[in-house]
């Protein structure tokens, strides 16, 4: 039950995270005009990964796409790549994890297969989250560098007669969305990896076999090292064996150490 909950929660958290990464990637407010200590401009500038926008005080907003590929800064291209890789990995991870969910039965898929799929999706979510966090952090670092450069210019470039309004950019809402979303995807991935441990059978490729002893009955379960003898311990008529060999799937399972997370 705990494994299912952990897996389900990991899936939901990752889903929210990836939705956030997609939202952040599409958002226009990666960098916004710094209004602190600036004259009250009747124009507000903000930029995204794909276009830059200007919101006039009149209420009209005009956005222009970056229609060049070669003319863009390498850092911006790198951020775009990281975010897209994060989205693609996250989307594949979501697809894989849907089939890996314990609460969903697909044919006669074994727990070992579900465990492997859960681990795969978990790793994908972790990498996806790291890509998003890295992308947002690279962009943030770029902003900080440019901010201090333009601040220096504001105080050194005042030699001329004509003053110029120095537009400085600060962190936009998309950066915070990206950081949170990346973190959620990462947490979701870790939860999936933890759930995977609980899904994996402790011993595979062995059958649980009941052996008939002539004097008294002993039910031997490989791996568990638990034997129940017939000497008075079955006073309440508990069924220890029914004469045949059963697989681990068919036998009522004992709580394993991985069930409590």
């Amino acid at each position: 039950m705990a494994v299912t909950a952990c897996q389900g929660l990991g899936f939901v958290v990752s889903l929210i995270g990836i939705a956030g990464i997609i939202a952040a990637t599409c958002m226009d407010q990666w960098s916004t005009q710094d209004l602190y200590n600036n004259p009250v401009t009747a124009v507000f500038n903000y930029q995204g990964l794909w276009r830059s926008c200007v919101r006039e005080s009149s209420g009209f907003t005009e956005c222009r796409g970056y229609f060049t590929l070669l003319g863009l800064p390498a850092m911006l291209q790198a951020v775009r790549a990281l975010m897209i890789v994060g989205i693609v990995l996250g989307a594949i991870g979501l697809l894989v994890s849907i089939f890996a969910l314990k609460c969903i039965r697909i044919g006669s898929m074994e727990d070992s297969a579900k465990a492997n799929m859960t681990l795969t999706s978990g790793i994908m979510f972790i990498v996806s989250g790291l890509c998003a966090i890295a992308g947002v952090s690279v962009f943030a670092n770029m902003l900080v560098t440019n901010f201090w450069m333009s601040t220096a210019n504001m105080y050194t470039g005042m030699g001329g007669m004509v003053q110029t309004v120095q537009t400085r950019y600060t962190f936009g809402a998309a950066l915070f969305v990206g950081w949170v979303a990346g973190g959620l995807t990462l947490i979701g991935g870790v939860m999936m990896c933890i759930a995977c441990r609980g899904l994996a059978p402790e011993e595979t490729n062995y059958k649980a076999v009941s052996y008939h002893a002539s004097g008294h009955s002993v039910a031997y379960k490989p791996g568990g090292f638990k034997a129940s003898t017939g000497f008075g311990s079955n006073t309440k008529n508990k069924k220890i064996y029914d004469g045949g060999a059963r697989t681990e799937d068919e036998v009522q399972s004992y709580p394993s150490k991985h069930d409590y997370v």
Epitope: T41, V43, S58, T164, V165
Partner: antibody, heavy 118, light 113 residues
Framework: DVQLVESGGGLVQPGGSRKLSCAAS????????MHWVRQAPEKGLEWVAY????????YYADTVKGRFTISRDNPKNTLFLQMTSLRSEDTAMYFC???????????WGQGTLVTVSA | DIVMTQSPSSLTVTTGEKVSMSCKSS????????????LTWYQQKPGQPPKLLIY???TRESGVPDRFTGSGSGTDFTLTISSVQAEDLAVYYC?????????FGAGTKLELK
């Protein structure tokens, strides 16, 4: 057709108060920022105040800050300018204007004359 | 505050003549975000409210005759009337639309010779 009609002007004593109104029609008033601009007799244009479509932010010229208050009633399609502590230099024709692309004023009212005199 | 300086203060012209007037701002009105200069030109005839002619320094408002042309960027701007008509006799104002307060120039009066 866009129409802006100012009212409320007249003769006021120095230190007195007056409230100007601007009735808008022919456009979605609640979607546009609005301004008050004044023009002293035989003088140039002077920007007075701005109010955004949602009533925030609001900006004033330094010459009227603390004395004039701009407001709007979107359901009634009306812009207001409450003027207090009036001085003789506030004597002017007061125009309301609609904010447009390029932060320009595309439509102006005919104006209402405010005369501050003893 | 941004100071807008218009020159000349008055111009005497004959109909059909080409005329230019200047407007200079104390600070750049150029916005890098959209590569536009936030300067507007208005025409005001006696007893009338101002009329919008040009915004973004060079974009003509709809309905404005194409003999009116705005040019310039940053701090130096020009309004040109390619062939002055009798109905163009008015006062022309430039306005800073970039930084509050949105200041106006003192105006250039166009008069008939």
């Amino acid at each position: 057709d866009v129409q802006l009609v100012e009212s409320g002007g007249g003769l006021v004593q120095p230190g007195g108060s007056r409230k100007l109104s601007c009735a808008a029609s022919g456009f979605t008033f609640s979607s546009f920022g609005m301004h008050w601009v004044r023009q002293a007799p035989e003088k140039g244009l002077e920007w007075v105040a701005y109010i955004s479509s949602g009533s925030s932010p609001i900006y004033y010229a330094d010459t009227v800050k603390g004395r004039f208050t701009i407001s709007r009633d979107n359901p009634k399609n009306t812009l207001f300018l409450q003027m207090t502590s009036l001085r003789s230099e506030d004597t002017a024709m007061y125009f309301c204007a609609r904010f447009y692309y390029g932060n320009s004023f595309d439509h102006w009212g005919q104006g209402t004359l405010v005369t501050v005199s003893a | 505050d941004i100071v807008m300086t218009q020159s000349p203060s008055s111009l005497t012209v004959t109909t059909g003549e080409k005329v230019s007037m200047s407007c200079k701002s104390s600070q750049s009105l150029f916005n890098r975000g959209n590569q536009k200069s936030y300067l507007t030109w208005y025409q005001q005839k006696p007893g009338q409210p101002p009329k919008l002619l040009i915004y973004w320094a060079s974009t003509r408002e709809s309905g404005v005759p194409d003999r009116f042309t705005g040019s310039g960027s940053g701090t130096d701007f020009t309004l040109t009337i390619s062939s002055v008509q009798a109905e163009d006799l008015a006062v022309y104002y430039c306005q800073n639309n970039y930084i509050y307060p949105l200041t106006f120039g003192a105006g250039t009066k166009l008069e008939l010779k």
